[in-house]
């Protein structure tokens, strides 16, 4: 028969034949000759290979360096690469997440809009009028003004998107 | 012509090892795997492994992991066979093969006190 | 492993007969729509084995036109159409399409 000229999923072409690509986690040894089938090891500790292949050399896991504020998520299998995410308080500066930075805090007259995952980083919203945040923070949202009304008291000092209204009491006419 | 010369026969003590050495000539050495088989007295063929000679990755039917190990010297074109902790069941006739294409003519190796 | 099965385990023949060795293997031997690697091989007494068909039917170099091999799957079949005295030896099956590679028992063809 003629050699072939392409292979079907899962095979590749050397030396004018079709050989079956190995199975994700293994790597190739050996490729498949007139007698005998392609000849596949499985992938060390610590390595993995996450596609039908012909590599002669697994990939190395990620490593989730402490230093840089990473921590494991999910650990690798010899098909599936480790995940890394970031400790408590910090997120991924990239989406490989190869290293972190402190969540961002919203200043005053900011408030959270969204809170830090380990892969995204605090989303920060003026406060609008009505609303205000006197601290930074990278949790606290915008408060609402007090109202004063509900406690029987007067507005005696106007509020900003930094500062809570003043309540006072309301002024009697003496008789 | 492609050619496998094995070593004579060997009689080893048990718990010894042996060395099986299988010179090829004939061909380029690295094109092909080397096969190694076990014919025990009046029985069938075994496959014990098989190693790359490009890579020098051996790999090992279960059954002789830890009893034999593969290798190659690629600068006189010979691959060999290292058995050891021999016992009388390891007493049989030893072959190398390209593949299943073309054999050496076999070793016997004889284990006895 | 697949365990290869021969049939029959001795078969005795005259010279000018056909000759059939059966094999079947414990689990299909294709693998990815591959070749299928079902081999056979005649050991003839104080011999090598020597590699008479590879790939189920094709026959390997200086292998006389008489041996021809058949079959799919699992089961398989080599057939001798004309049995010469040269032909008498064990024949075995070997599969190797899933690693460890591993061989039949093996068939004596002897003499009736």
């Known amino acids: 028969p003629e050699p072939p000229t392409a292979c079907r999923e899962k095979q590749y072409l050397i030396n004018s034949q079709c050989c079956s690509l190995c199975q994700p986690g293994q790597k190739l040894v050996s490729d498949c000759t007139e007698f005998t089938e392609t000849e596949c090891l499985p992938c060390g500790e610590s390595e993995f290979l996450d596609t039908w292949n012909r590599e002669t050399h697994c990939h190395q896991h990620k490593y989730c360096d402490p230093n840089l504020g990473l921590r494991v998520q999910q650990k690798g299998t010899s098909e599936t690469d480790t995940i890394c995410t970031c400790e408590e308080g910090w997120h991924c500066t990239s989406e490989a997440c190869e290293s972190c930075v402190l969540h961002r805090s919203c200043s005053p007259g900011f408030g959270v809009k969204q809170i830090a995952t380990g892969v995204s980083d605090t989303i920060c919203e003026p406060c609008p009028v009505g609303f205000f945040s006197n601290v930074s923070s990278a949790f606290e949202k915008c408060h609402p003004w007090t109202s004063c009304e509900t406690k029987d008291l007067v507005v005696q000092q106007a509020g900003t998107n930094k500062t809570d209204v003043v309540c006072g009491p309301q002024d009697r006419l003496r008789a | 012509e492609v050619q496998l010369q094995q070593s004579g026969p060997e009689l080893v003590k048990p718990g010894a090892s042996v060395k099986i050495p299988c010179k090829a000539s004939?061909?380029?050495?690295?094109?092909?795997?080397m096969d190694w088989v076990k014919q025990s007295h009046g029985k069938s063929l075994e496959w014990i492994g098989d190693?790359?000679?490009?890579?020098?990755?051996?790999i090992y039917n279960q059954k002789f992991r830890g009893k034999a190990t593969l290798t190659v010297d690629k600068s006189s074109s010979t691959a060999y066979m290292e058995l050891r902790s021999l016992t009388s069941e390891d007493t049989a006739v030893y072959y190398c093969?390209?593949?299943?294409?073309?054999w050496g003519q076999g070793t016997l190796v004889t284990v006895s006190a | 492993d697949v365990v290869m099965t021969q049939i029959p385990l001795s078969l005795p023949v005259s010279i000018g007969d056909q000759a059939s060795i059966s094999c079947r293997s414990s689990?299909?031997?294709?693998?990815?729509?591959?070749?299928?690697?079902l081999h056979w091989f005649l050991q003839k007494p104080g011999q090598s084995p020597k590699l008479l068909i590879y790939n189920v039917s094709n026959r390997f170099s200086g292998v006389p036109d008489r041996f021809s091999g058949s079959g799919s799957g699992t089961d398989f079949t080599l057939r001798i159409s004309r049995v010469e005295a040269e032909d008498l030896g064990v024949y075995f099956c070997?599969?190797?399409?899933?690693?460890?590679?591993?061989f039949g028992g093996g068939t004596k063809l002897e003499i009736k």
């Open positions: 093969a390209r593949r299943f294409a073309y």
């Open positions: 689990q299909s031997l294709v693998y990815s729509y591959g070749n299928t690697y």
């Open positions: 070997s599969q190797g399409t899933h690693v460890p590679w591993t």
């Open positions: 190693i790359n000679p490009n890579n020098d990755i051996s």
């Open positions: 004939g061909y380029t050495f690295t094109d092909y795997n």
